[in-house]
């Protein structure tokens, strides 16, 4: 082991205070006791240490806790958290939501770093599921958090947690993720009345099957075009012109502007032209009158 430089006379730190910001790196290494640092971690964040000095303090904690820091230290890491690697964080056992909040606060306003992703992963795995309080906290700091999870990870979200989800939290979710979230949302909001239910379920409808869209069309919901355009193409195709008209209500006029885009384009191709004409929107591309529509999927099922 390399021989350590001795602490100069009179410089031994009796407490973690601002005098330490004037210590050179080797003096911090030699004069600050790691155990003292661990018990007074809450002071470190209030003292304007340089990044180089924080490196020294981290090294001292690493030596004291080679198996990973205890939560009492983790909770007060403050800016020192930014010095941690994902490997460091994988050694931690973080169980308190307050600890999680304190560390997320340090990274606030920045993209989710690998450190934060690892921290959240450790925390959620430790809890066993994404409960409502955790989800509330995570989406408050990272609105796109939910959409960063795999469908498998989303399956651990209990329906009760869905109440914490805001529409913007789902902005970057793909259909596979909404397929998992939609049934949970449907379950969570099942006791609400029609209009209230639609307001809550609307952002999740990208995962809705045809039969649920048909049911919604009977409830005068007036779905806006933005929501309609996010619906699964395979769920929209079987809808009749009458059902789409009821589903969209006054917003049906917007179909004209979207006739070249999915799912509207694909849906038009499946409708009889004379049915489309009843909308009076000038939609073109439907099945000409007199043509027979064969449902090949049904034919395959019979053979």
């Amino acid at each position: 082991e390399v021989e350590k430089t001795a602490c100069p006379s009179g410089k031994k730190a009796r407490e973690i205070d601002e005098s330490l910001i004037f210590y050179k790196k080797w003096e911090l290494e030699a004069c600050v006791d790691a155990a003292l640092l661990a018990t007074q971690m809450d002071r470190v964040n209030a003292i304007p240490f340089t990044y180089e000095q924080l490196d020294v303090l981290k090294h001292k904690l690493d030596e004291l806790y080679p198996q990973g820091y205890p939560e009492s230290v983790i909770q007060h890491l403050g800016y020192l958290f930014l010095k941690m690697s994902p490997e460091d964080i994988r050694k931690w056992n973080v169980t308190s939501l307050e600890t999680l909040k304190a560390l997320l606060e340090v990274n606030k306003g920045h993209e989710m770093s690998p450190q934060v992703a690892t921290l959240i992963d450790r925390f959620v795995k430790g809890r066993g599921q994404l409960d409502k309080d955790t989800l509330d906290t995570l989406t408050a700091f990272y609105p796109g958090y939910l959409c960063s999870l795999s469908p498998e990870e989303l399956s651990s979200v209990p329906p009760s947690s869905i109440w914490a989800v805001r529409p913007q939290d789902l902005d970057t979710c793909d259909p596979r993720q909404l397929d998992v979230l939609y049934p949970k949302a449907r379950l969570a909001f099942q006791n609400m009345n029609g209009s209230e239910y639609f307001v809550k379920i609307q952002s999740f409808l990208g995962g809705a099957p045809t039969e649920d869209l048909k049911a919604l069309s009977q409830q005068n919901v007036s779905m806006d075009l933005a929501t309609f355009m996010k619906l699964r193409t395979d769920a929209v195709l079987p809808l009749t012109v009458a059902e789409v008209q009821k589903l969209l209500g006054p917003h049906v006029e917007g179909l004209k502007a979207e006739e070249r885009h999915r799912p509207v384009r694909d849906w038009i191709l499946r409708q009889r032209q004379d049915d489309l004409d009843t909308l009076g929107l000038g939609l073109q591309g439907g099945i000409p009158n007199g043509y027979l529509v064969l449902d090949l999927s049904m034919q395959e099922a019979l053979s």
Epitope: G10, K11, E18, R43, I47
Partner: antibody, heavy 116, light 110 residues
Framework: EVQLLESGGGLVQPGGSLRLSCAAS????????MSWVRQAPGKGLEWVSG????????YYADSVRGRFTVSRDNSKNTLYLQMNSLRAEDTAVYYC?????????WGQGTLVTVSS | QSVLTQPPSASGTPGQRVTISCTGS????????VSWYQQLPGTAPKLLIY???KRPSGVPDRFSGSKSGTSASLAISGLRSEDEADYYC???????????FGGGTKVTVL
């Protein structure tokens, strides 16, 4: 017990000079940054200057920069404030204080009056 | 005009709780620790709270400090007649490269 004792205040004419001293005891003076803070009669506190343990960087309020100079002698456990080109608005009680980011100990202050 | 903003006065009856606010910006309170100082009439200031919420030894636990974003506050619970004094908040300002104080709050015990 930490003690800070200022001296050197008094009456001086506008444009004149004065040197304040602060004798420190009860702590390892050479380990700590030191500061000067002043308070005009009936007014609030105003930070004047700060100096780290090794005198490396010196910090000044805009209102005194270029006129005041802070220094220290670690062998004598003493902090100084050299004040030149004094103005009427420099009239105040001048306190020396331990540290630069949070003043945990203060002297009793010395009154500087700038008047003709 | 002080860089940190405090109400000029606050008052309460004995036993009451009084709170003093201190508002700054991202370059001072937002990124540095806040301290609170008590100045009794005719005496030098005394450190009451440091590092946002810590009390030096000898300061009663009736005094508490907190910080959130670019604001800080000092709370005095169980107000006593001897708490009648001027209270100042202070913080280092990274843009000015200097220490800044609030204008002070005179606390009166009714």
């Amino acid at each position: 017990e930490v003690q800070l004792l200022e001296s050197g205040g008094g009456l001086v004419q506008p444009g004149g000079s004065l040197r304040l001293s602060c004798a420190a005891s009860g702590f390892t003076f050479s380990n700590y940054a030191m500061s000067w803070v002043r308070q005009a009669p009936g007014k609030g506190l105003e930070w004047v200057s700060g100096i780290p343990p090794d005198s490396g960087s010196k910090y000044y309020a805009d209102s005194v920069r270029g006129r005041f100079t802070v220094s220290r002698d670690n062998s004598k456990n003493t902090l100084y404030l050299q004040m030149n080109s004094l103005r009427a608005e420099d009239t105040a009680v001048y306190y020396c204080a331990k540290n630069m980011f949070s003043f945990d100990y203060w002297g009793q202050g010395t009154l500087v009056t700038v008047s003709s | 005009q002080s860089v940190l903003t405090q109400p000029p006065s606050a008052s309460g009856t004995p036993g009451q709780r009084v709170t003093i606010s201190c508002t700054g910006s991202s370059s001072n309170i937002g990124s540095n620790a806040v301290s609170w100082y008590q100045q009794l009439p005719g005496t030098a200031p005394k450190l009451l709270i440091y590092y946002n919420s810590k009390r030096p030894s000898g300061v009663p636990d009736r005094f508490s400090g907190s910080k959130s974003g670019t604001s800080a506050s000092l709370a005095i619970s169980g107000l006593r007649s001897e708490d009648e004094a001027d209270y100042y908040c202070g913080s280092w300002d990274s843009s000015l490269n200097g220490y800044v104080f609030g204008g002070g709050t005179k606390v009166t015990v009714l």
